[in-house]
Amino acid sequence: KESCDVQLYIKRQSEHSILAGDPFELECPVKYCANRPHVTWCKLNGTTCVKLEDRQTSWKEEKNISFFILHFEPVLPNDNGSYRCSANFQSNLIESHSTTLYVTDVESASERPSKDEMASRFWA
């Protein structure tokens, strides 16, 4: 039988290249059993992680997987940076690995590439 510990499965050292002006959903996969924990997002600023109080978030339940989503509608150039999700569960604070967004400002690009083109160009 699976343990009922809360776990946050943001992939270690994960990175996402995204375009300013596009919508984007940053996913925090959350494993829990009976009671859904309270989850928050923060953005790293040096060694501290600043809680994102005023951002749109939501839960998504999909094929027995739960996600706590941070919405970027749209992505802005200053969304560039590293993010972490945290869960409060039975008085314990559980922190995820950080995930980094690399934002390309399309204003400076002469021709707007497709998402898939940009991803392959950015990461290849």
Epitope: S3, D5, Q7, L8, Y9, K11, R12, Q13, S14, E15, H16, S17, I18, F24, E27, P29, K31, E62, I65, F67, I94, H97, K115, D116, M118, A119, S120, F122, W123, A124
Partner: antibody, heavy 118, light 111 residues
Amino acid sequence: EVQLQESGPSLVKPSQTLSLTCSVTGDSITSAYWNWIRKFPGNKLEYMGYISYSGSTYFNPSLKSRISITRNTSKNQYYLQLNSVTTEDTATYYCARSHYYGYYFDYWGHGTTLTVSS
Amino acid sequence: DIVLTQSPASLAVSLGQRATISCRASETIDSYGDSLMHWYQQKAGQPPKLLIYRASNLESGIPARFSGSGSRTDFTLTINPVEADDVATYYCQQTDEDPYTFGGGTKLEIK
């Protein structure tokens, strides 16, 4: 039911480029992580890399200068390209999906066997 | 890279007996708060098949004869009792750290 199917050449000449396709049904490649793995004739399994739900990629550093992984979301396919192949790249190539809760490979393709030979 | 050392490399077990396969990691596998160590079975001509995920969780549809245990650097796959259909090569895999790595495999045969 999630299904993955690899396709591509069975024979490639040294120094050429290998291109493989993984066609996915039963799930969208805009969720989870989609991987390439290969198995050498001596039975060693090597992890090659992934493309994520957002389109970002990770490559095994041992292959980084030669590999790219791309996708076509409208076809629900992702692709492996391996440049400058040698006989050492002779292997069976698998595509597989990683589960979000721990990244284990819960669905695999049947594999496609590649021989690199002149 | 995290190196996974499997032992033994091959194993011959009588039907109905217990088979135990060990996987030792060169670094601790626990950065997610649990152990991202998994076990696969591969039969000739087939892709690997997930048996155990996150050290001790039995994949859906896999018989309860298969079990996994361990933490940190030492992990074990146990098959009890062994059946004729279990003839295969078994691999451990870690997904705690990139690049993911596999053990060298353990070939199980019937004595």
